[in-house]
């Protein structure tokens, strides 16, 4: 694969991943009410990083923002921070990579500068993807922990009125945003790796520019064998890699209703 193609594809994959990270961060369905083995309710709860929502079978949906910083769990704050850092790094990565793209000519910028910028954007995308993956994974771990804790509470006796009155505890499971986040983080990471690979192809090989003296009998001629490498030929530097391009499929929250509780 040519450097231009590798760099371009890396940029596009990173861009898709970055868009996915933004989508996941903004989505309300990070955690959704677990309906398995629960009495079927006419109310469905789901939560995001920024607000929690309730959808009634009537079709009425009410969302409330988390209007406090101090009252929120440290883990939620950490996940928010990781996702925002991922987005910020992604923005910088995109800006840098636009200037680094080989197909775009900006002034007298040489390949060496473009290579450095490509490497920089690649590293930024890798870190951005890692931030998203860690953020989503931390949230998922938090959900799993809370899920089993609430399950234990469920079966450790129902309180109130001598056990006559049952209180149903709302348990939460993985929401669509987690899967979007994982896929998006992965794509951003893959795109970043591709950019780094493209950088290696953009870097001029120093050995091609070294003058070598050959002493022929009776003559003292210094010459450079092979001359300069043509800018399109990369010889052994070319890596034949097959890039698997996945797509982050997202579903709109308000239209996503395929749950056993919901009939609207």
């Amino acid at each position: 694969m040519s450097v231009t193609a590798c760099q371009g594809l890396g940029f596009v994959v990173s861009l898709i991943g970055f868009a996915g990270i933004i989508a996941a961060t903004c989505m309300d369905q990070w955690s959704t009410q677990d309906l398995y083995n629960n009495p079927v309710t006419a109310v469905f709860n789901y939560q995001g990083l920024w607000r929690s929502c309730v959808r009634e079978s009537s079709g009425f949906t009410e969302c409330r923002g988390y209007f406090t910083l101090l009252g929120l769990p440290a883990m939620l704050q950490a996940v928010r921070a990781l996702m925002i850092v991922g987005i910020v790094l992604g923005v910088i990565g995109i800006l840098v990579s636009i200037f680094a793209l080989k197909c775009i000519r900006i002034g007298s910028m040489d390949d060496s500068a473009k290579a450095k910028m490509t490497l920089t954007s690649g590293i930024l995308f890798i870190i951005s993807g890692i931030c998203a993956i860690i953020g989503v994974s931390v949230f998922a771990n938090m959900l799993v922990t809370n899920f089993w804790m609430s399950t234990a509470n469920m079966y450790s006796g129902m309180g109130g009125m001598g056990g006559m009155v049952q209180t149903v505890q709302t348990r939460y499971t993985f929401g669509a945003a987690l899967f979007v986040g994982w896929v998006a983080g992965g794509l951003t990471l893959i795109g970043g790796v591709m950019m780094c690979i493209a950088c290696r192809g953009l870097t001029p090989d120093d050995s091609n520019f070294k003058a070598v003296s050959y002493h022929a009998s009776g003559q003292n001629v210094a010459y450079r064998p092979g001359g300069f490498k043509a800018s399109t030929g990369f010889g052994s530097n070319t890596r034949n890699k097959k890039i698997y391009d996945g797509g982050a499929r997202t579903e709109d929250d308000e239209q996503s209703h395929p749950t056993k509780y919901d009939y609207v």
């Epitope: 309710t41 929690s52 309730v54 009634e56 009537s58 149903v168």
Partner: antibody, heavy 118, light 113 residues
Framework: QVQLQQSGAELIGPGTSVKVSCKAS????????IEWVKQRPEQGLEWIGL????????NYNEKFKGKATLTADKSSSTAYMQLSSLTSDDSAVYFC???????????WGQGTLVTVSA | DIVMTQSPSSLTVTAGEKVTMSCKSS????????????LTWYQQKPGQPPKLLIY???TRESGVPDRFTGSGSGTHFTLTISSVQAEDLAVYYC?????????FGSGTKLEKK
């Protein structure tokens, strides 16, 4: 304004079936659930089930599964409830209602009296 | 199914009197997501369909006089009529709107002395 107009009273024999209609007006029929409620003479209210007119999706009270079948016709903005294998226990007033905030029933039909008698 | 227990089954009142009726559910109707109780109160007069009075346990439907007040949370709910009028004589039902199947209480009948 929102209105639900139900079909007239029915007098039918045991073992037969009856189809009660509920014509909606004054709102987007497909956007709101229609619920059905049974009330026997001098008795309380029983929820039969609901239908989403937009998708045709239904949710029945287990007690009425096999007894009631809920359908809806979007073109005429009408919801239907068919009651089969009727017995004297099915003699009651049947109401249709439109869902509202809090899953409550804000708008009701006038009721259809079904009398099962030999 | 959720059992809704209403008490008393009937109340004899005079005009201007304050009336309180109770409704208890076998499971909590409080949704943790929005901290709302999915309990509804209806009024039914003879030969008429029920009329929505209060939803979310305490939210009065538009057009309902402010003498009607709903309160309570979880499993214990109350409907209060601050000053009963002649037109308030009817049967009052509470309903679970949280769990399927939706269930109604057996009703509290308000009669005049």
């Amino acid at each position: 304004q929102v209105q639900l107009q139900q079909s007239g009273a029915e007098l039918i024999g045991p073992g037969t079936s009856v189809k009660v209609s509920c014509k909606a007006s004054g709102y987007a029929f497909s956007n709101y659930l229609i619920e059905w409620v049974k009330q026997r003479p001098e008795q309380g209210l029983e929820w039969i089930g609901l239908i989403n007119p937009g998708s045709g999706g239904t949710n029945y009270n287990e007690k009425f599964k096999g007894k009631a079948t809920l359908t809806a016709d979007k073109s005429s903005s009408t919801a239907y409830m068919q009651l089969s294998s009727l017995t004297s226990d099915d003699s009651a007033v049947y109401f249709c209602a439109r869902v509202y905030y809090g899953n409550s029933f804000a708008y009701w039909g006038q009721g259809t009296l079904v009398t099962v008698s030999a | 199914d959720i059992v809704m227990t209403q008490s008393p089954s009937s109340l004899t009142v005079t005009a201007g009197e304050k009336v309180t009726m109770s409704c208890k559910s076998s499971q909590s109707l409080l949704n943790s997501g929005n901290q709302k109780n999915y309990l509804t109160w209806y009024q039914q007069k003879p030969g008429q369909p029920p009329k929505l009075l209060i939803y979310w346990a305490s939210t009065r439907e538009s057009g309902v006089p402010d003498r009607f007040t709903g309160s309570g949370s979880g499993t214990h709910f109350t409907l209060t009529i601050s000053s009963v009028q002649a037109e308030d004589l009817a049967v009052y039902y509470c309903q679970n709107d949280y769990f399927y199947p939706f269930t109604f209480g057996s009703g509290t009948k308000l009669e005049k002395k």
